[in-house]
Amino acid sequence: MAVTACQGLGFVVSLIGIAGIIAATCMDQWSTQDLYNNPVTAVFNYQGLWRSCVRESSGFTECRGYFTLLGLPAMLQAVRALMIVGIVLGAIGLLVSIFALKCIRIGSMEDSAKANMTLTSGIMFIVSGLCAIAGVSVFANMLVTNFWMSTANMYTGMGGMVQTVQTRYTFGAALFVGWVAGGLTLIGGVMMCIACRGLAPEETNYKAVSYHASGHSVAYKPGGFKASTGFGSNTKNKKIYDGGARTEDEVQSYPSKHDYV
């Protein structure tokens, strides 16, 4: 029962997380114009992964897509790639986990198969969550670097007395949505992996062998460390799931400098 609950909860948490990752990827507010300590303008700028928008005080909003592919900064492309990979892995993980759910019966699917599918989907959710968190963090790092660069020369002189204001950008709502969604997907994936351990019953493929010593009637049942309990006539095959050391180390390094505005 606890295993089913853990698996179901993991699925739901991951589902919410992946929906959040998709929402964050589509949102326009990845970076928003910094209003603190800035001259009050009647125009509000904000940018997403796919387009930049301008909202005028009058009520009009105009958005322009980034129609170039090669002309975009490498870091922005990297963030896009990470988010898309996260979405794809998450979607596949959801598909796999639906069939792996203990509460859903599909033909004569064995518990071992369900356990493997649960583990697979769990790993996919973990990687998906990490991709989203990495993507959002790379973008946030880009913003922080650009913020301090533009603060250093916020007012650039243009021919003597004339001043032009450089727009500074800060964290948009999409970043927070992305971080939370990535975290939820990650947690959901961990829950799926935990559920996987308890999904299948233990397994022993050792048949009982009786050694008849002279004058004695003692039955020896060699079963190693995974011997069945007691010395009764239990000859049923029990499946063993060895939830041993399965590790996935993903080391990703990103440049710390960028030129995206």
Epitope: T41, A42, N45, V54, S57, S58, F60
Partner: antibody
């Protein structure tokens, strides 16, 4: 079609308050901003302030202490209140709708206000 | 506050002539987000409310004759009226629509001979 009409008292005594109503038609106050602009006799235009679709307001820095702009979306009315009037506040007061580029694309005909005892 | 300086303060032209009105702002009105200049031009004929001519420094309002052309970027802007007509007798104002408070220039009075 879009129309704006100001209605004011005409004559106001010094130190009193001025209240002007701008009644609009042809557009929604929840979507578009309305600006207030005044023009003293024989002089140029002066922007007083604006109320935007979301209800937020911006005022001219020189008038912020004595100017308030409100609206009633259901009645399609915008209200300007200017307190502690002086002779220099004598002007024609216009309300104008905001359009693209925050430009004022439709104007009322204006209401003339004289501050005199 | 942003200071808008218009020049000349007045000029007299004959019909059919081409005229250029200048406007200078104390700060750049160019928005980096959409690369548009938030400068507006208005025409005010005697005894009438102002009328919108040009917004975003160069976009002509619908119904405005083609002889009115706005140009410029950053801090320097011009309104060009080619083939001036008798009905163009008016005062022309430029306005900053970028920084609060919105500010108007002192106006250029166009007179016809």
């Amino acid at each position: 079609q879009v129309q704006l009409k100001e209605s004011g008292p005409g004559l106001v005594a010094p130190s009193q308050s001025l209240s002007i109503t701008c009644t609009v038609s042809g557009f929604s106050l929840t979507k578009f901003g309305v600006n207030w602009v005044r023009q003293p006799p024989g002089k140029g235009l002066e922007w007083l302030g604006a109320i935007w679709g979301d209800g937020s307001t911006n005022y001219h820095s020189a008038l912020i202490s004595r100017l308030s702009i409100n609206k009633d979306n259901s009645k399609s009315q915008v209200f300007l209140k200017l307190s502690s009037l002086q002779n220099v506040d004598t002007a024609t007061y216009y309300c104008a709708k905001s359009g693209y580029g925050n430009a004022m694309d439709y104007w009322g005909h204006g209401t003339s206000v004289t501050v005199s005892s | 506050d942003i200071v808008m300086t218009q020049s000349p303060s007045s000029l007299t032209v004959t019909t059919g002539e081409k005229v250029t009105l200048n406007c200078k702002s104390s700060q750049s009105l160019l928005n980096s987000g959409n690369l548009k200049n938030y400068l507006t031009w208005y025409q005010q004929r005697p005894g009438q409310p102002p009328k919108l001519l040009i917004y975003w420094a160069s976009t002509r309002e619908s119904g405005v004759p083609y002889r009115f052309t706005g140009s410029g970027s950053g801090t320097d802007f011009t309104l060009t009226i080619s083939n001036v007509q008798a009905e163009d007798l008016a005062i022309y104002y430029c306005q900053n629509d970028y920084f609060f408070p919105f500010t108007f220039g002192s106006g250029t009075k166009l007179e016809i001979k």
